[in-house]
């Protein structure tokens, strides 16, 4: 369950990361991994990470995309190695946001 | 194979106004941003402007913002830049470019030079 | 803005020498920064994208490096061609380009 409390000592995962938060580390430690696509000025800012506490992920992971964001959330170790966050398509049912397609 | 052609540029006197056009092919357009950049005579590069896809996000430099809108008709596989209030320093050569979402500016145009000048 | 020094800002190489150009970033941008090559009146043309990406169709010999606010361009072997200026520029945030460095023949 998503809403479940975490448990006293949480299961942490080994994440991929890449990003501005990452330093020179190319992974990192957390309760839940995360994928996230913003756009800056226009341009795809693509960035991978954790959540070291259970909390900080619950509401970020919760989030619809946006017309300028999306976030894709897992747990397990390199869960997110092969997520790549992409903002909402035309169907979708995301008011507001724009039709993108990856080519 | 990827074709970006502008059009527009010309000579036009401080305070005036220029729509710039930048035709596109090759590619499925409306599955894409679409850039203007510009390089003053002599000097390096700067960016000015992007839109999303539907036309619906723009976003722009400081040194145009509230001068230069930039829009798309994607059923004519066009991408524009309106310029309006123009200033001297707005002489330059623009180019159009298009990025795929993990390239950016992957592909530009030839350019079309803007002269501001009385 | 993110502001991107880019060094030296002209330099002089013969054919078949190895060019290193290094552009600065006045902040982390992890490796969001790309290269251009421009010839006198033409377009850029992309070469290095993610800060070490080989673009489709651009030559081996070009190879990028770098993250957070230090990169590097390197010809292994000048050819004549290569005589370009060359720019980076940066997508983290307020994109802003380096600007530029001129390779000249010696």
């Known amino acids: 369950m998503e809403d479940e409390k975490p448990k006293v000592n949480p299961k942490l995962y080994m994440c991929v990361c890449e990003g501005l938060s990452c330093g020179n580390e190319d992974h990192c430690e957390g309760q839940q991994c995360f994928s996230s696509l913003s756009i800056n000025d226009g341009f795809h800012v693509y960035q991978k990470g954790c959540f070291q506490v259970y909390e900080q992920g619950k509401m970020t992971c919760k989030t619809p995309p946006s017309p300028g964001q999306a976030v894709e959330c897992c747990q397990g170790d390199w869960c997110n190695r092969n997520i790549t966050a992409q903002l909402p398509t035309k169907g979708k049912s995301f008011p507001g946001t724009q039709n993108f397609h990856l080519e | 194979e990827v074709q970006l052609v502008e059009s527009g540029g010309g000579l036009v006197q401080p305070g005036g106004s220029l729509r710039l056009s930048c035709a596109a092919s090759g590619f499925t357009f409306s599955n894409y941003y679409m850039y203007w950049i510009r390089q003053a005579p002599g000097k390096g590069l700067e960016w000015v402007s992007s839109?999303?896809?539907?036309?619906?996000?723009?976003y722009y430099a400081d040194s145009v913002k509230g001068r230069f809108t930039i829009s798309r008709d994607n059923s004519k596989n066009t991408v524009y830049l309106q310029m309006n209030s123009l200033r001297a320093e707005d002489t330059a050569v623009y180019y159009c470019?298009?990025?795929?979402?993990?390239?950016?500016?992957?592909?530009w145009g030839q350019g079309t030079l803007v002269t501001v000048s009385s | 803005d993110i502001q991107m020094t880019q060094s030296p800002s002209s330099l002089s190489a013969s054919v078949g020498d190895r060019v290193t150009i290094t552009c600065k970033a006045s902040?982390?941008?992890?490796?969001?920064l790309n290269w251009f090559q421009q010839k006198p009146g033409k377009a850029p043309k992309l070469l290095i994208y993610?800060?070490?990406s080989l673009q489709t169709g651009i030559p081996s010999r070009f190879s990028g490096s770098g993250s957070g606010t230090d990169f590097t361009l390197t010809i292994s072997s000048l050819q004549p061609e290569d005589f370009a200026t060359y720019y980076c520029f940066q997508y983290s945030s307020g994109p802003t380009f380096g600007q530029g460095t001129k390779v000249e023949i010696k």
């Open positions: 839109i999303n896809t539907d036309g619906g996000s723009t």
């Open positions: 902040q982390n941008i992890y490796k969001y």
């Open positions: 993610y800060s070490n």
């Open positions: 470019a298009k990025s795929t979402p993990n390239i950016p500016l992957a592909y």
